[in-house]
């Protein structure tokens, strides 16, 4: 058992051009919080699979209000660590997802509004009990800097938190079958809960419920002495039951090396020679190789034949990240020409073209719509020597016949919230704005200071339109 700890150092714009807009504004202050999700790294899990190792949510950070005109700085962070307790052994290799969430604090309908700002993911090797590991991850134009570690909860110790330690009962040495807890030489490994009845003097276990015998003893509970031929190479205390020297436990007894590692004694302890793909004091930590399938979402793994050489994931279209764990915002590449609206549908990219343009990427300039009526309130206008349909909001296509999800085109300006109705849509304006689509600031130089329905100002018509 133990705790995975995550410390967020900073969240802000990454280096290079295209700095992101501040997620908060004078009109709409907000605060950040973080979510971490951990999964055992060797399981072939999709990015959407449950957080099998655990998850945690941070506290809310301080309220942040953007200073107009200033570039987006590193944003104020919540205090404290994110802690994810784990009950069983630490797997050594794990995958993580860290999400940065924004909580808007304006006058929201139905309480605060939450939205996901950034998500980073990765797969790492980490031994429990080690120092803090630092990391930097980027999500779009944002950059997240953080540190993490796994630590065992007493009495567990070791790189996987599977060994148990207790203070020594005797000052000189540990009890039978128990090794010193390096590096805590003043503590001893504590016995696991072995099979009921397992001899505390002559039996031990590496897994709960088993009973393995020290040399010179046998039987299901290690209570039966073997023949005195075991006294031929004496080393250890005298046994009262056999009248000869029963060999005491050597450091390699019971083979402490996991995962097929071979044990050799050293003057002070033991050393494990690990098979390929494993490392650690007892070969308990697995290295990530292509054989482990580290690439999500159908990514192709190249290289990484052994744990010490890096693997590279070649991601399929639509995914990116060192493990193909991030979905590409393909619209950020602005593939739609001539002012077309980009829609990333997941399985495909779609451009909703402005009036007068067509084609998969709105690349075709339609010559003429003369002689055609523009449907749904669209108007035929001159433009560049040709007639085109200029469509009303919510409609598109050559003749304005294509009906869109009324909220898909973000029809509410200045942070207004769109609600689709059977009759069309409604814009709920942020404080200090009004109009059918919240397009009019009431006081342009102080919009945030006004209530949602400022005194002395009323719309002439209901704010519901097709």
């Amino acid at each position: 058992a133990g705790v995975f700890e995550l410390q967020i150092h900073s969240f802000g714009p990454g280096p290079g051009p295209g700095a992101p807009r501040s997620p908060c504004s004078a009109r709409l202050p907000c605060r950040l919080f973080f979510r971490v999700c951990l999964k055992p790294g060797l399981s072939e899990e999709a990015a959407e699979s449950p957080c099998a190792l655990g998850a945690a949510l941070s506290a809310r950070g301080p309220v942040y209000t953007e200073q107009p005109g200033a570039p987006a700085p590193d944003l104020p962070l919540p205090d404290g660590l994110l802690q994810v307790p784990f009950r069983d052994a630490w797997p050594g290799t794990f995958s993580f997802i860290i999400e940065t969430w924004r909580e808007e604090l304006g006058d929201q309908i139905g309480g605060p509004a939450w939205s996901l700002l950034a998500r980073v993911a990765g797969r790492r090797r980490l031994a429990a009990g080690g120092p803090w590991a630092r990391d930097i991850q980027r999500a779009g134009a944002w950059e997240l800097r953080f540190s993490y570690r796994a630590r065992c909860e007493p009495p567990a110790v070791g790189t996987a938190c599977t060994r148990l330690c207790r203070p020594r009962s005797a000052p000189s040495r540990c009890g039978p079958g128990l090794r010193p807890c390096a590096p805590l030489e003043d503590e001893c490994e504590a016995p696991l809960v072995c099979r009921a009845g397992c001899s505390p003097e002559h039996g031990f276990c590496e897994q709960p419920g088993e009973c393995r015998c020290l040399e010179g003893w046998t039987g299901p509970l290690c209570t039966v002495p073997v023949s005195t031929s075991s006294c031929l190479s004496p080393r250890g205390p005298s046994s009262a039951t056999t009248g000869c020297l029963v060999p005491g436990p050597g450091p390699c007894d019971g083979n402490p090396c996991a995962n097929g590692g071979s044990c050799s004694e050293t003057p002070r302890s033991f050393e494990c020679t690990c098979p390929r793909g494993f490392y650690g004091l007892r070969c308990e930590v697995s290295g990530v190789t292509c054989a482990d399938g580290p690439c999500f979402n159908g990514g192709l793994c190249v290289g990484g034949a052994d744990p010490d050489s890096a693997y590279i994931c070649h991601c399929p279209p639509g995914f990116q990240g060192s493990n193909c764990e991030k979905r590409v915002d393909r619209c950020s590449l602005q593939p739609c020409r001539n002012g077309g609206l980009c829609l990333d549908l997941g399985h495909a990219l779609r451009c909703r073209c402005r009036a007068g343009f067509a084609g998969p990427r709105c690349e075709h300039d339609l010559d003429d719509c003369a002689g055609r009526a523009c449907a749904n309130g669209g108007t035929c206008v001159e433009g560049g020597g040709a007639h085109r349909c200029s469509c009303a909001l919510g409609f598109g296509g050559r003749d304005c016949r294509e009906r869109a999800d009324p909220c898909a085109a973000r029809p509410c300006a200045h942070g207004g919230r769109c609600y689709a109705h059977f009759s069309g849509l409604v814009c709920a304006c942020a404080p200090g704005y009004m109009g059918a689509r919240c397009e009019f600031p009431v006081h342009p130089d102080g919009a945030s200071a006004l209530p949602a329905a400022p005194p002395g100002l009323r719309p002439g018509d209901p704010q519901r339109y097709l």
Partner: nanobody, 117 residues
């Protein structure tokens, strides 16, 4: 980008009338929401009247019944007809356009209206 040019400001006596015009350089004024704002000396700029892309109109309580906003899509223009003018209507009047094409607000340079006897 949208360029806005106001005209029609000037000196007028209390009770008089004036019409402000704003011409927008834009391929289709139907994709603009248009408004008039004013800023009196030492005061915040405030919305006087607005007309959405769909024709719905908005007025400040202080001008209701006296001012009328209208648009002429063929001429890419918006107008503010001001009747029964009062001294407190003295201000610089600004034309405003919100472009639904690029989701940006645009402002004119302003035209001064002075109501004085």
């Amino acid at each position: 980008e949208v360029q806005l040019v106001e005209s029609g400001g000037g000196l007028v006596q209390p009770g008089g009338s004036l019409t402000l015009s704003c011409a927008a350089s834009h391929s289709s004024v139907t994709s603009l929401s248009l408004a008039w704002y004013r800023q009196a000396p030492g005061k915040k700029r405030e919305l006087v009247a607005g007309i959405s892309y769909d024709g719905s109109k908005y007025y400040a309580e202080s001008v209701k019944g006296r001012f009328t906003i209208s648009r002429d899509n063929a001429k890419n223009s918006v107008y503010l007809q001001m009747n029964s003018l009062r001294a407190e209507d003295t201000a610089v009047y600004y034309c405003y356009a919100y472009s639904w094409t690029d989701r940006l607000p645009y402002w004119g340079q302003g035209t001064l209206v002075t109501v004085s006897s």
